[in-house]
Interface confidence: low
């Protein structure tokens, strides 16, 4: 276990021509904050892919209003480090994304607005326990200077934080098979501590806190023998001793989710749904406060009222979950009024309004005939806030620009013949069928499958589809 630490030194205009103008002014007072996302390995995944090693959000920096006449300086930064705790081994190679966010504090409708100013990314090799590494990254005309390191949390040591050290119990030597913890010669390497309750006979661990099962045993603590019904399992190799299939390792076998998290398999891995107060790939990070940056996707973290809820994430639109980690289908709330089509674009929710309506949620009724013309002799009709053209014979569409052929779609079923009519179309049905589109068979006994006819219309009448 350990902590990745990031120290931002400066964020400001980079060298060379085309220096950016300050994002803050008297007109747009603002403050900065940073988000770091870590992924194991030298991945080149999209910025939106999960921060499997963890993520952190900085505090907000000081409110800044650029002084008149001053050149665009380095912008004031939040205090403190960004810390990303990791429970498992430090991978040695990692990818990072550092985002610089601006929080506008002007006279905004609906509270402060956040916008991404710059995003830098890189892939690095880093041994835990080493010195601070310095870096400079540029994003457009902006330049970010920062340092980072990975350090192990006691009792872990080593370049991957996988070795555990304990103070020597005797001054002379360490226990059998255990080496001194160089350079801490007064400490000894400690045996791995597996997950509490892990079966000493049927389980083992390669990293602290895990419990991996020997063949033939399963369960979170390797106490459950694999039953003979496993012969039906489609997964895993055939066992030479039993002649039946022994399940191979599934992503959720042994339940990798700690602290009461529930595991669900994904096509290539697993996903833990964590209870409040825990997060991380395996719900392994606990005792979380806002300083740990537990809120993802731009969620705003506020301190909770009691120790069991040390923080609460207020999620931006489009995200939910105790850590704002889940994308929500905002269109399911049906925010678009007056029949507008909802589009969830991720960064924004858009409503595509029906004719005659406008506004972010299609809430405005338009006088749509104003300044509008209906083509080909059509006349504009107002009604219900919607612009509608009453088209001359032979034309259709919203503005009567389309030449109408009501029979083009072959609307008459069961071999019925279609005739264009001044008010729509008429289907002449083949023998044995009836209905506006010849859709109902006439039963041999004379009854029909047609539902009860509306008043004034007999089931046998030819029907006009309007």
């Amino acid at each position: 276990a350990g902590v990745f630490e990031l120290q931002i030194h400066s964020f400001g205009p980079g060298p060379g021509p085309g220096a950016p103008r300050s994002p803050c002014s008297a007109r747009l007072p603002c403050r900065l904050f940073f988000r770091v996302c870590l992924k194991p390995g030298l991945s080149e995944e999209a910025a939106e892919s999960p921060c499997a090693l963890g993520a952190a959000l900085s505090a907000r920096g000081p409110v800044y209003t650029e002084q008149p006449g001053a050149p665009a300086p380095d912008l004031p930064l939040p205090d403190g480090l960004l810390q990303v705790p990791f429970r498992d081994a430090w991978p040695g190679t990692f990818s990072f994304i550092i985002e610089t966010w601006r929080e506008e504090l002007g006279d905004q409708i609906g509270g402060p607005a956040w916008s991404l100013l710059a995003r830098v990314a890189g892939r690095r090799r880093l041994a835990a326990g080493g010195p601070w590494a310095r870096d400079i990254q540029r994003a457009g005309a902006w330049e970010l200077r920062f340092s980072y390191r990975a350090r192990c949390e006691p009792p872990a040591v080593g370049t991957a934080c996988t070795r555990l050290c304990r103070p020597r119990s005797a001054p002379s030597r360490c226990g059998p098979g255990l080496r001194p913890c160089a350079p801490l010669e007064d400490e000894c390497e400690a045996p791995l501590v597996c997950r509490a309750g892990c079966s000493p006979e049927h389980g083992f661990c390669e990293q602290p806190g895990e419990c991996r099962c020997l063949e033939g045993w399963t369960g979170p603590l390797c106490t459950v023998p694999v039953s003979t019904s496993s012969c039906l399992s489609p997964r895993g190799p055939s066992s030479a001793t039993t002649g039946c299939l022994v399940p191979g390792p599934g992503p959720c076998d042994g339940n990798p989710c700690a602290n009461g998290g529930s595991c669900s398999e994904t096509p290539r891995s697993f996903e833990c749904t964590c209870p409040r107060g825990f997060y991380g790939l395996r719900c392994e990070v606990s005792g979380v406060t806002c300083a740990d940056g537990p809120c993802f996707n731009g969620g705003l973290c506020v301190g909770g009222a009691d120790p069991d809820s040390a923080y609460i994430c207020h999620c931006p639109p489009g995200f939910q979950g105790s850590n704002c980690e889940k994308r929500v289908d905002r269109c399911s709330l049906q925010p678009c009024r007056n029949g507008g089509l909802c589009l969830d674009l991720g960064h924004a929710l858009r409503c595509r309004c029906r004719a005659g309506f406008a506004g972010p949620r299609c809430e405005h009724d338009l006088d749509d005939c104003a300044g509008r013309a209906c083509a080909n002799g059509g006349t504009c009709v107002e009604g219900g806030g919607a612009h509608r053209c009453s088209c001359a014979l032979g034309f259709g569409g919203r503005d009567c620009r389309e030449r109408a052929d009501p029979c083009a779609a072959r609307p008459c079923a069961h071999g019925g013949r279609c005739y264009a009519h001044f008010s729509g179309l008429v289907c002449a049905c083949a023998p044995g069928y009836m209905g506006a589109r010849c859709e109902f068979p006439v039963h041999p006994d004379g009854a029909s499958a047609l539902p009860a006819a509306p008043p004034g219309l007999r089931p046998g009448d030819p029907q006009r589809y309007l």
């Epitope: 002014s25 008149p68 506008e104 409708i109 609906g110 607005a113 924004a348 972010p360």
Partner: antibody
Amino acid sequence: QVQLQQWGAGLLKPSETLSLTCAVYGGSFSGYYWSWIRQPPGKGLEWIGEIIHSGSSNYNPSLKSRVSISVDTSKNQFSLKLSSVTAADTAVYYCSRGEYGSGSRFDYWGQGTLVTVSS
Amino acid sequence: AIQMTQSPSSLSASVGDRVAITCRASQGIRDDLGWYQQKPGKAPKLLIYAASSLQSGVPSRFSGSRSDTDFTLTISSLQPEDFATYYCLQDYDYPLTFGGGTKVEIK
């Protein structure tokens, strides 16, 4: 090529509400200020207000009680409403695009709409 | 509100003349000022933004400068198509304010 096309009623009676819409073609809608500016006949330019794609808006205090600017990002349009108009509101009204945080840079303008207020 | 005092309100000049128009801000506005040209019946056209940056497509005879709260638009050699009205605009703070305009006429 970015184009701003505006429309709305050109003749109003006192106390009515002026309503204009500006459609943006051929460019990004986010990342810019979208402003309304007016010019009474023979006089100078006056900034009315602005909006950004998220709906955040700012108005000239001299008009704030009567003005409302809204945005419809699905159509790349923004609209101006000015209530209780008087003859003093007679002007050519322009919509314009301003770069976000880049200095005074109203780089694209609508063609202008002459609005006359007369009883 | 920030007041933008533009001078002169009008001037007469000949083709080839060097012309300077000034705007003074009532307080510091960094370099958040632009210059616009307007011809009768047309929308204004951006010439200079951020006090001294030439807008793309604008002839290089137009230039802008700043000294504290005084801003100057200079036309190095007046051309026939330059006869128009010129406005400055500050967007440092709300409300955005224009200068009163300078009408450049043919002498």
